[in-house]
Interface confidence: low
């Protein structure tokens, strides 16, 4: 390998290096590759040099494109026609000189917070891009469209948030915001201007015209209207609170809708149960006042008994299925009909036929195995399914099974 690299001169972004060649193993060295390592890099990285390609007869090079105020060490690797040799021992560690910062914070945004606050946030500039000691941020903001920027200096490289509090800040009003950088060398650039909204106030009016209806034993649907009159808080969506009559209101469940949606479905409820519901508008500041509470009773559960005694027979490209009638219990919804679900043995999608009889005729090709199941349906939803019946592919003209 080449002998240890010497750093002859260092600036904020360049380093002048020199080295002595090592043995070439009887094959002339054709080029040298310069590598650098910093506390922030993952291992050794190739760096750009002047000249761009360092030939085997050149023993000096200038490394360019370094970050200011970062500790570097360098090494060289020789190459010939046979391949790449062992790297040299690393140079001493040297820090580049300081310079004005050039990188601005990423993702300047904000919003939220408490009344009369403007919250501004950003991603901090990594240490290796701060270019010097005494790094900090300049937060500039102004009411949208105004001429004069208000400035705040935060002398901390770790700062990522600034909150401006003033009674004159109106709820959810737009501010133009930018965040600049500085260090001991002076001020760097500002980030692009972005629009950030001050903290909003929660909605001041409740939703109107609440209505709920039962869809099944487990599902209900709730409808409401936007608040009537001037609502001071922006509405981001609505929060529906619901609880069973037998439970306490403080244990109520909540679901949220987003945007203009003024209805929602609530699922996984208990059958034949009385539920109470109320609706509030919400935004990032919180929820507004609650609507009046409405009541709805879920429908009776569907029949628990599956269809039994299923008999099938086939002839003339038809499968005829018969089964016993399902009788609902007193606390169950009346049977309105039956769903016959069938699919080919090797096909995943299921077809459904509805009937209010206890038999059905299917016209199905006989060159496939079929899987069939039957379940009752009611106002309370679908009841229990029968066990799956496999009807094998039929080559003869008549077959039966149960």
């Amino acid at each position: 390998p080449p002998e240890a690299v010497t750093i002859d001169e260092i600036t904020d972004t360049t380093a002048q290096l020199s080295w002595r060649p090592g043995p070439d193993n009887h094959s002339p060295i054709t080029m040298y590759v310069i590598q650098a390592r910093t506390p922030f890099s993952v291992g050794w990285q190739a760096v750009n040099t002047v000249p761009d390609l360092v030939d085997g007869k050149t023993f000096t090079a200038t490394v360019v494109g370094l970050n200011p105020w970062v500790e570097y060490e360098f090494r060289t690797v020789a190459a010939n026609v046979i391949g790449i040799g062992e790297p040299s021992r690393p140079s001493e560690k040297r820090r580049t000189e300081e310079a004005l910062p050039e990188v601005t914070p990423a993702n300047v945004s904000g919003g939220g917070g408490s009344k009369s606050e403007l919250v501004i946030t950003w991603e901090t500039v990594p240490e290796e891009l701060q270019n010097g000691r005494g790094f900090g941020y300049v937060v500039a903001f102004r009411p949208h469209g105004k001429m004069i920027w208000m400035l705040t200096v935060l002398a901390s490289a770790d700062a990522s948030r600034y909150v401006f509090r003033n009674e004159s800040v109106r709820p959810f009003s737009p501010f133009e915001v930018k965040v600049g950088v500085f260090n001991n060398k002076g001020e760097g650039p500002f980030s692009p201007t972005t629009l950030v909204y001050s903290a909003e106030e929660e909605p001041t009016k409740p939703p109107a015209s609440i209505f709920a209806r039962s869809l099944s034993a487990t599902d209900i649907e709730v409808f409401w209207a936007s608040p009537i009159g001037k609502n001071r808080g922006r509405i981001q969506g609505y929060e529906v609170k619901y609880w069973r009559h037998d439970d306490k209101e403080e244990n109520a469940k909540k679901i949220r809708t987003v945007g203009n949606q003024t209805s929602t479905k609530i699922t996984n409820l208990k059958g034949s149960a009385l539920y109470h519901l109320s609706v509030k508008a919400y935004n990032s500041a919180g929820t507004g006042p609650s609507s009046a509470t409405v009541n709805v009773t879920t429908r009776k559960p569907p029949p628990s008994q599956p269809p039994g005694n299923i008999i099938w027979n086939s002839s003339d490209s038809k499968i005829i299925l018969n089964w016993d009638q399902v009788k609902a219990l007193d606390n169950e919804s009346e049977v309105k009909g039956y769903k016959v679900l069938y699919r080919w043995n090797r096909q995943s999608s299921t077809s459904v036929i509805e009937t209010n009889k206890t038999s059905v005729e299917l016209s199905l090709p006989f060159d496939e195995d079929y899987i069939i199941e039957i379940k009752p349906f009611s106002d309370g939803g679908d009841g229990s399914s029968s066990e799956q019946i496999r009807i094998p592919k039929i080559s003869n003209s008549y077959a039966r099974g149960s």
Epitope: P143, H144, G145, E176, Y197, K230, N231
Partner: antibody
Framework: EVQLLESGGGLVQPGGSLRLSCAAS????????MFWVRQAPGKGLEWVAE????????WYAPAVKGRFTISRDNSKNTLYLQMNSLRAEDTAVYYC????????????????WGQGTLVTVSS | ELTQDPAVSVALGQTVRITCSGS???YGWYQQKPGQAPVLVIY???NRPSGIPDRFSGSSSGNTASLTITGAQAEDEADYYC?????????FGGGTKLTVL
Amino acid sequence: EVQLLESGGGLVQPGGSLRLSCAASGFTFSSFNMFWVRQAPGKGLEWVAEISGGGGSTWYAPAVKGRFTISRDNSKNTLYLQMNSLRAEDTAVYYCAKSADTWSYGAATIQAWGQGTLVTVSS
Amino acid sequence: ELTQDPAVSVALGQTVRITCSGSSGSYGWYQQKPGQAPVLVIYDNTNRPSGIPDRFSGSSSGNTASLTITGAQAEDEADYYCGGYDGSTDVFGGGTKLTVL
């Protein structure tokens, strides 16, 4: 499909009054801020007035403040512009327009426009 | 006050950029063809409404917004207006007449 149909334009003398209407359909009218925007013959667009979805807040361009009144009747899905003390420089095609959002703060985004109604102020 | 160049021309299939400068932090762009109502083509500086071809794009830096049409078509010949907010009222730029050669 959003539809906005303006009416009420015509010829009026300087100092006179006119009331424009805009019938809206195809969206929840009361949920959206609405605008009037005008365009003088051969000229660019000029924002005239804005009203919040519930009708509680209104905003006006300096050139029309105190002379024009924007209002809405959410039960009829209709937007209005009452124009008083009309001047020759008010001559323009007046467009009814719908905001893109339920709420509009900062720069308005106009998602849909009517075809416009011509107002001519001349003696 | 939002400022636009009065007229810009572009060769068919080439790229053109229309700029708008002023004090607004959030811009929209509207296309208007003769005798028709305007159509929103870009909102909130960079977002394209559904139905608008992807050759239209928007950007913003500081107090300047740009509308770029990559691969201009004959049907893109129109007046283009930027819209924004000056802190108290909504405003439109003076408009840029785009000619496709």
